[in-house]
């Protein structure tokens, strides 16, 4: 059974992941640039099911495409540094799902825009944090 300290650590890591995803979404929502239209043409794979930490495997597999799209957005008004940001998210995801996981991600048939993708994973973090609080 998880100890209260391990639960607290998990909660903190999820809060960090949530904030990182919210920061990306906020940056995109604030973005007034023709590049935004192009960013929205990129399609992301969505998890068929995302209710447990092991399902973060689906997020991990989409981090590289996410970084590529964020690289498009680089400007003086976009303050997220994609390499640092994705690296940070990757570390958190690995710690949360465990590096030993052999879970095979199942994706939904429909792809999503970056905004829909981020909102899905933000909701995932929020729902798990709520069960831990």
């Amino acid at each position: 059974a998880p100890t209260s300290s391990s639960t607290k650590k998990t909660q903190l890591q999820l809060e960090h992941l949530l904030l990182d995803l919210q920061m990306i979404l906020n940056g995109i929502n604030n973005y007034k640039n023709p590049k935004l239209t192009r960013m929205l043409t990129f399609k992301f794979y969505m998890p068929k099911k995302a209710t447990e930490l092991k399902h973060l495997q689906c997020l991990e597999e989409e981090l590289k495409p996410l970084e590529e799209v964020l690289n498009l957005a680089q400007s003086k008004n976009f303050h997220l540094r994609p390499r640092d940001l994705i690296s940070n998210i990757n570390v958190i995801v690995l710690e949360l799902k465990g590096s030993e996981t052999t879970f095979m991600c199942e994706y939904a048939d429909e792809t999503a825009t970056i905004v829909e993708f981020l909102n899905r994973w933000i909701t995932f973090c929020q729902s798990i944090i709520s069960t831990l609080t």
């Epitope: 903190l12 960090h16 904030l19 990182d20 919210q22 920061m23 979404l25 906020n26 929502n29 303050h79 997220l80 540094r81 640092d84 940001l85 690296s87 940070n88 933000i122 929020q126 709520s130 609080t133």
Partner: antibody, heavy 113, light 107 residues
Framework: QVQLVQSGAEVKKPGASVKVSCKAS????????MHWVRQAPGQGLEWMGI????????SYALKFQGRVTMTRDTSTSTVYMELSSLRSEDTAVYYC??????WGQGTLVTVSS | DIQMTQSPSSLSASVGDRVTITCRAS??????LAWYQQKPGKAPKLLIY???SLDSGVPSRFSGSGSGTDFTLTISSLQPEDFATYYC?????????FGQGTKVEIK
């Protein structure tokens, strides 16, 4: 104990910049993201943005984008908030807050010609 | 942006009174709501997080309830030190937004 100590009050002329510091102690600096919130005299609270203290990347409220810059120095466990092109409406108390349960004492910035 | 609307904007009450402040979000924020107390010249102090969880060291006379769009802060028996301004805040999505505040004054 856990605390955030901010720099002292500032008086600036319109068009100038101000840089407010917030020094953390009593906890692992990189453990909690830092938000900045301001409060104009007699007004409510307004979120300005957030910085990840470990990696240093930021996200700002649209209202402040282009005028605000948040940075950090991990060697001194200090976060900075710089606001440029100051105008009289920027007269406010500026707060840093870590995890929302720990707040700095506030820094009064007065913009006056 | 999510708008947070508090009511009333001010109220007068006596020591021992039960006080209720409400906060409404312009869209559902689940339970991603916090309540703060602020006294003149001081930084806000976190009272309630996750809509109903009491922060450590906060007296049990303070309680929070609600989810979705409607939330309530209740002070079961007002004490002299409770006269202050109270703010609700959503952290469901960025930008983080606050209610306009409710000033609790002595009757």
């Amino acid at each position: 104990q856990v605390q955030l100590v901010q720099s002292g009050a500032e008086v600036k002329k319109p068009g100038a910049s101000v840089k407010v510091s917030c020094k953390a102690s009593g906890y692992t600096f990189t453990r909690y993201y830092m938000h900045w919130v301001r409060q104009a005299p007699g007004q409510g609270l307004e979120w300005m943005g957030i910085i990840n203290p470990r990696a240093g990347y930021t996200s700002y409220a649209l209202k402040f984008q282009g005028r605000v810059t948040m940075t950090r120095d991990t060697s001194t466990s200090t976060v900075y908030m710089e606001l440029s092109s100051l105008r009289s409406e920027d007269t406010a108390v500026y707060y840093c807050t870590s995890g929302w349960d720990v707040w700095g004492q506030g820094t009064l910035v007065t913009v006056s010609s | 942006d999510i708008q947070m609307t508090q009511s009333p904007s001010s109220l007068s009450a006596s020591v021992g009174d039960r006080v209720t402040i409400t906060c409404r979000a312009s869209q559902s924020i689940s339970t991603w709501l916090a309540w703060y107390q602020q006294k003149p010249g001081k930084a806000p102090k976190l009272l309630i997080y996750a809509a109903s969880s009491l922060d450590s060291g906060v007296p049990s006379r303070f309680s929070g309830s609600g989810s979705g769009t409607d939330f309530t802060l209740t002070i079961s028996s007002l004490q002299p030190e409770d006269f202050a301004t109270y703010y609700c805040q959503q952290s469901y999505s960025f930008p983080v937004t606050f209610g306009q505040g409710t000033k609790v004054e002595i009757k």
